[in-house]
């Protein structure tokens, strides 16, 4: 064998015993008539030597050592070689060592070209014998980063003020690659960062440096890991120890992108997240050991990347296709920010986009699946438009507002389902009538159902909001002058069981002046409470709503207000309130920024309220709150 | 099992002569460079000389060049130091070793003492 | 000829400790060096050859590694077994062969 280093090469070959066997005769270096067992080749020199045995192989080893200086000159980036060739050298086991020095302030990146890398452990071994070791620096102190075989998730490692990159290749591996480049990055200002990237499922286990000794003291050591968003991954910790700390605390810090709340920072000894859908950091922070007893800091850990399980795995198809002008929105519920780690909840279409907001359009069929440890987190918010432009076309046409099956049977809660309904201006008007009569929501008589409907207005300088709706009540259809929004609201899980409860139908109708009239037949026995719309706020300047009181023939309702002046101060107009019934057409009239509300009234057949407003001066509002209630006509109302 | 016993140690007057001998079992002298060391009363150690037989190869340290001789019997797998002319700084435990991968098997010692 | 200077002479430590002792040739010697322990009244072990290649059977506590012509043991976490005194030794076939003067690893 030859072997001729250039001069200026900076690379050192040495020749070496490998580990001890039992062999029954030694092999030596022959080198001008003298045996050995060493032999160092340095830049410039061209030594001619032989084995004295057969198969050399199977006791030496080779080491080929290129010392690459970034400090007094410029550094040779881009794709290493390995150099002298494979070729050119005895079939031993060998070693090629690159050993770069860089300031502190350089940061020095490997690329490893597809395979990428898998990091081992004490004691493990590659199965095809190709290891990759590599180590870094701390001013003079050499810091293991780890070793690695082939078929991993590794893809870069960056480093500063220097790195040593050991290839390990078996005497009969082919490979005449190194397979991996050198670039130079800005100061990472930290250990190491080690990017591993996930194609597809699939687990790394990673540990920090020099494991299983100790972590350098106050250092710190970042992983990052690129994931497929329709995947997620979970963090297990396999193995830890913590050192004794002095000053600071020693901890994992996670980064998310996209998340509030980062850092999210753990200790070592706290359950690490899991379900995280994307890309995320992993960083492990040393503190200021005690002098006396520092311990060690070590850290071994698990990174699993799979489909989401069990119920988060299926698919799900919302059909759309036949709907019109509806949008369905599946986003986070909103919770208090906490500091603690929430791990992604993220919903998924045709399972490759997945993003923690999903808007689905109507006209077609989407297929969506969870990627979510907990699918209470999200909920789904749904619009749809139904508007009339042709008031010829549209009179007296119905349609019903029913949450779509398809929605029912996804496993997100549903939130909102709101429907627009639009009419041409002054020409159509619209009524809702519900398939169980409705009660409205006051504080003295709550509705205590899974769902509710909100009705307002939806004429965007229009602030009208008619109030919230619950089935089981006495009022029997809504009039609406001109647009409004009806919202069916849940406010329980067990909405899905109480489902066949809503049911409420529009239909356009011809155009009346009153912003609202509600039609109320109360049951026997039953107190029915009313108030005003936009309760809280005041009742629209100039606005005019009206209740359609039915009282049955053998009852008498008794009407009461709940307060004894409405409290309203008008600036222009008046505010009044005229109470008819409806048969003999009498009324009464009260002014309701002067005079004192009506003391409780029976009515013996039914009736009219009619509450109008003035323009109220600020502060000032109508509101009013009254009930009805019915008793046989038999009872001595004296 | 590969092992070395050294002899022939004892007390001898100063300029008198000692043989040691190193008797190996497991393994043929023949193949390996085989040396002796030696250890002063609580000093430290002191490599003394080396053979390589089957090229006859003899390599001696300066404080013992042209009195000691080593030498080997490859048939009966022994490896000898003939010492002449001992001196009173010769007093040592004497080493035989086996060098492969280093000194990976060494004797159990033997005492020379030289003193009047 | 090459020296071989050990330091630190004799050192104390305590069970579960860190140790390191160092030894730096005169000149050149590549990566031909050994390490050797030794227990009163018993023959040198072999620990480390070429520097820092770990001898069969040697627990994996020893290691050893080359800066130039600074040569350094380890021994990561000391055991009941380690206290003893500990040798380098320069080259196999490049004479004469030399040793560094030991490190007596006592118990605190």
């Known amino acids: 064998f030859e072997i001729a280093l250039p001069r200026e090469s900076n690379i050192t070959v040495l020749i070496k015993l490998g580990t001890p066997t039992l062999l029954a005769k030694p092999c030596y270096i022959v080198i001008s008539k003298r045996h050995i067992t060493m032999l160092s080749i340095k830049s410039g020199e061209r030594i001619v030597f032989t084995f004295s045995c057969q198969s050399p192989e199977n006791h030496f080893v080779i080491e080929i050592q290129k010392n690459i200086d970034c400090m007094s000159g410029p550094c040779p980036f881009g794709e290493v070689q390995l150099q002298p060739s494979t070729s050119l050298l005895p079939t031993l086991n060998r070693t090629f060592i690159w050993d770069v020095k860089a300031h502190k302030s350089i940061g020095l990146e490997l690329q490893f070209s597809i395979p990428r890398l898998r990091q081992i452990g004490p004691g493990e071994s590659c199965p095809d014998g190709v290891t990759h070791s590599i180590s870094g620096r701390i001013d003079a102190t050499v810091v293991r980063i780890g070793t690695f075989c082939s078929n991993g998730t590794v893809s870069r490692i960056k480093m500063q003020e220097g790195v040593k990159m050991a290839l390990h290749l078996p005497w009969f591996h082919p490979r005449n690659v190194s397979g991996f480049s050198i670039a130079n990055r800005s100061s990472i200002k930290r250990l190491c960062i080690i990017e591993s990237v996930f194609e597809g499922e699939g687990s790394a286990t990673l540990m920090s440096a020099n494991y299983p000794e100790g972590f350098p003291e106050d250092e710190l050591m970042t992983w990052q890991f690129v994931v497929p968003a329709h995947l997620r991954a979970s963090v297990s910790f396999l193995n830890f120890n913590l050192s004794n700390c002095e000053r600071k605390e020693e901890r994992v810090e996670y980064y998310i992108p996209g998340s509030t709340t980062n850092p999210e920072v753990f200790k070592l000894e706290d359950k690490q997240p899991g379900n995280m859908a994307g890309n995320f950091n992993l960083s492990l922070q040393g503190c200021d050991q005690d002098a006396q007893s520092p311990g060690i800091l070590r850290l071994q850990f698990q990174v699993l990347v799979q489909h989401p399980q069990n119920e988060s795995n299926k698919i799900y198809v919302v059909d759309l296709s036949n709907e019109r002008a509806m949008s369905l929105t599946i986003e986070p519920r909103p919770v208090k920010q906490s500091r603690k780690f929430v791990p992604g909840c993220f919903v998924c279409l045709e399972s490759r986009t997945c993003s923690s907001n999903l808007t689905l359009t109507s006209g077609s069929k989407h297929k969506i699946s969870f990627l979510c440890d907990d699918l209470t987190r999200l909920w789904m918010n749904v619009e749809k438009t139904i508007s009339c432009t042709d008031h010829r076309y549209c009179q007296r046409k119905s349609y019903s507002l029913q949450v779509p099956s398809d929605i029912l049977h996804l496993p997100v809660e549903l939130h909102d389902f709101s429907w627009k309904l639009l009419v041409p201006k002054d020409r159509l008007s619209l009524v809702l009538v519900p398939a169980q009569k409705l009660q409205q929501h006051t504080h003295e008589k709550p509705c205590n159902t899974s769902f509710s409907y909100l009705v307002a207005s939806a004429i965007p300088s229009q602030d009208l909001y008619f109030g919230s709706f619950c089935p089981g009540g006495s009022i029997k259809q809504i009039q609406v002058k001109q647009n409004i929004s009806v919202t069916l609201r849940t406010f329980a899980p067990s909405f899905q069981q109480e489902a066949s409860r809503q049911g409420l139908t529009v239909s356009f109708i011809p155009y009346f002046k009153e912003e609202g009239v509600f039609t109320v037949t109360p049951d026997t026995k039953s107190k029915v409470y009313l108030r005003t719309p936009n309760w809280d706020r005041g009742l629209p300047s100039l606005t005019s709503v009206s209740w359609n009181i039915s009282v049955p023939r053998d009852q008498v309702a008794c009407l009461t207000f709940f307060k004894e002046r409405s409290g309203v101060v008008c600036q222009t107009g008046r505010a009044f309130m005229i109470i008819q019934e409806q048969r003999t057409r009498a009324e009464e009239i009260f002014s309701l920024d002067e005079d004192v509300l009506p003391k409780p009234s029976f009515h013996h057949h039914s009736f009219w309220v009619n509450i109008s407003n003035c323009s109220p001066t600020s502060g000032k509002q109508l509101d009013l709150l009254f009930s009805v209630t019915l008793t046989p006509r038999t009872v001595d109302l004296t | 099992e590969v092992q070395l016993v050294e002899s022939g140690g004892g007390l001898v007057q100063p300029g008198g002569s000692l043989r040691l001998s190193c008797a190996a079992s497991?393994?043929?002298?023949?193949?390996?460079?085989m040396h002796w060391v030696r250890q002063a009363p609580g000093k430290g150690l002191e490599w003394v000389a080396s053979?390589?037989?089957?090229?006859?190869?003899?390599s001696y340290a300066d404080s013992v060049k042209g009195r000691f001789t080593i030498s080997a019997d490859t048939s009966k797998n022994t490896a000898y130091l003939q010492m002449n002319s001992l001196r009173a700084e010769d007093t040592a435990v004497y080493y035989c070793?086996?060098?492969?991968?280093?000194?990976?098997?060494w004797g159990q010692g033997t005492l020379v003492t030289v003193s009047s | 000829d090459i020296q071989m200077t050990q330091s630190p002479s004799s050192l104390s430590a305590s069970v579960g400790d860190r140790v390191t002792i160092t030894c730096r040739a005169s000149?050149?010697?590549?990566?031909?060096v050994a390490w050797y322990q030794q227990k009163p009244g018993k023959a040198p072990k072999l620990l480390i050859y070429?520097?820092?290649s770990l001898y069969s059977g040697v627990p994996s506590r020893f290691s050893g590694s080359r800066s130039g012509t600074d040569f350094t043991l380890t021994i990561s976490s000391l055991q009941p077994e380690d206290f003893a005194t500990y040798y380098c030794?320069?080259?196999?076939?490049?004479?004469?062969?030399?040793f560094g003067q030991g490190t007596k690893v006592e118990i605190k």
């Open positions: 070793a086996r060098v492969y991968y280093g000194f990976d098997y």
């Open positions: 497991g393994f043929n002298i023949s193949y390996y460079y």
């Open positions: 053979i390589y037989s089957s090229y006859g190869y003899t």
């Open positions: 000149q050149s010697v590549s990566s031909a």
């Open positions: 070429s520097a820092s």
């Open positions: 030794q320069q080259s196999y076939y490049v004479y004469p062969i030399t």
